[in-house]
């Protein structure tokens, strides 16, 4: 058993049929010595008396809020949560496996630039009695500070018969060094509590690997005289790191017909303009990627050809 | 060229070669995203590599103030990786494919380091750790880790030279 936060404790259980469970001793936080009784949750049934209560925790029915009283007055609470371990593996029932970029990916993170700011998100089908707490650091043995905000519900989607909820959190490295080559990864730890179930999820990454620029901005077309070609121009997104002579992007320009079955025309360039062949009903799209490190491409910025 | 006395390197040449290094490093090991090498306990193998750190003056302001600190750091790293790529980690079994970009990568690392340091002038270089994995699978894993680390190193070097070519060239 260990303390998650004040008056909240996590009991780690090997979860299998007829498992013996864990013996837990609860101590009432009071100077009083006599006349103390214990109850669980809303029940008035007295579980025991005395300053300490010893219980055998085997299942979720044994978890919950234990309260010690004296003469009708509440003295203190201890909330017990269960963390299940099945076949040596901690349970991952609360969050959904996003399977990208690989299986068992519960947390996904992205950064728009090298400032040390990043966003992580996760998915669940659970709608109520759910809380998250996020901690982060740079490195684990001698951790350097990363400050994370509160996790918030950022999207709701219907997936077949189920509703899916997306939560996200923003974090900022306290002393970020955008130009340096990272040697220690960022560690992100998410504590998830659903009713009386506790789970924790972690992710480890370098900012450089989670970079995904915003799409190029101010995408414009200029038709060339007596030609079916157009000059496409765009600008770096506002959120990208500066100066651009140092933090450079490379771009992919794509001409795509109205149907996915039509062949695409793609041009790769380090410049912020390109000349492409335009055709009726086609659209021109541009996306960006770090010029020197192959992290994710941005989403497309698009304009119609005509 | 970064010669004694601190004159400027051939920024544009360095820019072109460092960008080529980035391309080669990724073509040598493109599937990095599908393999989380940090799960393989690489502390004892690749944390001895020279990293371009915050105090090395490789940020835009540091380059403007005095690019020599940063260039020396980059040079150290280039020599370090050039030696690693020439070591039995890469020359031993399993043999690299005949058209592997590792050979070109090795030559380009040497080429860029020579651009930064002509013969007759010697910056101190970092000691290469003795990494001699006995098993071919260990060697393969170590190659991946080294290339992964090299990708990060050459990305920073390429940014330095691109910025230098754009803002510090005579």
């Amino acid at each position: 058993i260990w303390e998650l936060k004040k008056d909240v404790y996590v009991v780690e259980l090997d979860w299998y049929p007829d498992a013996p469970g864990e013996m837990v001793v609860l101590t009432c936080d009071t100077p009083e010595e006599d006349g103390i009784t214990w109850t669980l949750d809303q029940s008035s049934e007295v579980l025991g008396s005395g300053k300490t209560l010893t219980i055998q925790v085997k299942e979720f029915g044994d978890a919950g809020q234990y309260t010690c009283h004296k003469g009708g007055e509440v003295l203190s609470h201890s909330l017990l949560l269960l963390h299940k371990k099945e076949d040596g593996i901690w349970s991952t029932d609360i969050l959904k496996d996003q399977k990208e970029p690989k299986n068992k990916t519960f947390l996904r993170c992205e950064a728009k630039n090298y400032s040390g700011r990043f966003t992580c998100w996760w998915l669940t089908t659970i709608s109520t009695d759910l809380t998250f707490s996020v901690k982060s650091s740079r490195g684990s043995s001698d951790p350097q500070g990363v400050t994370c905000g509160a996790a918030t519900l950022s999207a709701e989607r219907v997936r077949g018969d189920n509703k899916e909820y997306e939560y996200s959190v923003e974090c900022q490295e306290d002393s970020a060094c955008p130009a340096a080559e990272e040697s220690l990864p960022i560690e992100v730890m998410v504590d998830a509590v659903h009713k009386l179930k506790y789970e924790n999820y972690t992710s480890s990454f370098f900012i450089r690997d989670i970079i995904k620029p915003d799409p190029p901005k101010n995408l414009q077309l200029k038709p060339l005289k007596n030609s079916r070609q157009v000059e496409v121009s765009w600008e770096y997104p506002d959120t990208w790191s500066t100066p651009h002579s140092y933090f450079s992007l490379t771009f992919c320009v794509q001409v795509q017909g109205k149907s996915k079955r039509e062949k695409k025309d793609r041009v790769f360039t380090d410049k912020t303009s390109a000349t492409v062949i335009c055709r009726k009903n086609a659209s021109i799209s541009v996306r960006a990627q770090d010029r020197y490190y192959s992290s994710s491409w941005s989403e497309w910025a698009s304009v119609p050809c005509s | 060229r970064a010669v004694p006395g601190g004159s400027s390197p051939a920024w544009t040449q360095c820019q072109q070669l460092s960008q080529k290094l980035c391309t080669l490093a990724w073509s040598a090991h493109p599937l990095v995203g599908h393999m989380d090498l940090r799960e393989e306990g690489d502390e004892e193998t690749t944390n001895d590599v020279p990293h371009i750190q915050c105090g090395d003056g490789c940020d835009p302001q540091g380059l403007r103030d005095n690019s020599q600190f940063c260039l020396q750091r980059i040079h150290q790293g280039l020599i370090f990786y050039e030696k690693l790529l020439g070591s039995d980690i890469f020359t031993g079994e399993p043999s690299l494919l005949p058209d592997s970009p590792v050979g070109q990568l090795h030559a380009s690392l040497l080429g860029l380091s020579q651009l930064l340091q002509p013969e007759g002038h010697h910056w101190e270089t970092q000691q290469i750790p003795s990494l001699s994995p006995s098993q071919p699978w260990q060697r393969l894993l170590l190659r991946f880790k080294i290339l992964r680390s090299l990708q990060a190193f050459v990305a920073v070097a390429a940014r330095v030279f691109a910025h230098g070519a754009a803002t510090l060239s005579p």
Epitope: N226, S227, R228, Q229, V255, G257, S259, K260, R261, E262, K263, K264, D265, R266, V267, F268, T275, V276, I277, R279, K280 | -
Partner: antibody
Framework: EVQLVESGGGLVQPGGSLRLSCTAS????????MTWVRQAPGKGLEWVGT??????YYASWAKGRFTISRDNSKNTLYLQMNSLRAEDTAVYYC????????????WGQGTLVTVSS | DIQLTQSPSFLSASVGDRVTITCQAS??????LAWYQQKPGKAPKLLIY???TLTSGVPSRFSGSGSGTEFTLTISSLQPEDFATYYC?????????FGGGTKVEIK
């Protein structure tokens, strides 16, 4: 006059290489998707490959052996053919795409490539 | 890769006949199909594109129809100059392919 003229055909030994050219006049090659099509003696038409602004597409049998490129300043399209085989013997046509590469509205007269020892 | 199956391979007809040639795609190519006419020793000539759009300068007796996997070229009243070989050409997002051709001969 708007036209395409192919050149560079001829006799080549198996395993050899050849570069065909297709020069456009009366219009700007850079404004169009350009395609190479071939026709073996007495046989049907066969698509070789296409170049857009810079993207290229090839028939599966042509990948790795044939390369299409263009020099917009010379208004010329090229087909580089390597590791030639007897079955590559054909008349090679270049053609201009009206929109992409299936609606070929302008064709050259063709150039004959013979692969034989 | 897509395949285009053209039928018939040979067709004997007389001047004034209505002639129909079909082209079947192995997968849905929407309307990315064109029809060409080729005479011996000459380059092919585009007749119809987008399955049914007549190329300017091509007589209106030629028409095209279909989409997806089934396409048809119809010559409403065969003229002496129409005796030639006809090809369909289809495309998807990665490849382009010709049908095997239909030779229209004088009966």
């Amino acid at each position: 006059e708007v036209q395409l003229v192919e050149s560079g055909g001829g006799l080549v030994q198996p395993g050899g290489s050849l570069r065909l050219s297709c020069t456009a006049s009366g219009f700007s090659l850079s404004s169009y998707w350009m395609t190479w099509v071939r026709q073996a003696p007495g046989k049907g038409l066969e698509w070789v490959g296409t170049i857009a602004t810079s993207s290229t597409y090839y028939a599966s049998w042509a990948k790795g052996r044939f390369t299409i490129s263009r020099d917009n300043s010379k208004n010329t399209l090229y087909l580089q053919m390597n590791s030639l085989r007897a079955e590559d013997t054909a008349v090679y046509y270049c053609a201009r795409g009206l929109t992409t590469d299936y609606d070929l509205d302008l064709w050259g007269q063709g150039t004959l490539v013979t692969v034989s020892s | 890769d897509i395949q285009l199956t053209q039928s018939p391979s040979f067709l004997s007809a007389s001047v004034g006949d209505r002639v129909t040639i079909t082209c079947q795609a192995s997968e849905d190519i929407e309307s990315y199909l064109a029809w060409y006419q080729q005479k011996p020793g000459k380059a092919p000539k585009l007749l119809i594109y987008s399955a049914s759009t007549l190329t300017s300068g091509v007589p209106s007796r030629f028409s095209g129809s279909g989409s997806g996997t089934e396409f048809t070229l119809t010559i409403s009243s065969l003229q002496p100059e129409d005796f030639a070989t006809y090809y369909c050409l289809g495309a998807d997002d990665t490849t382009t392919v010709f049908g095997g051709g239909t030779k229209v001969e004088i009966k």
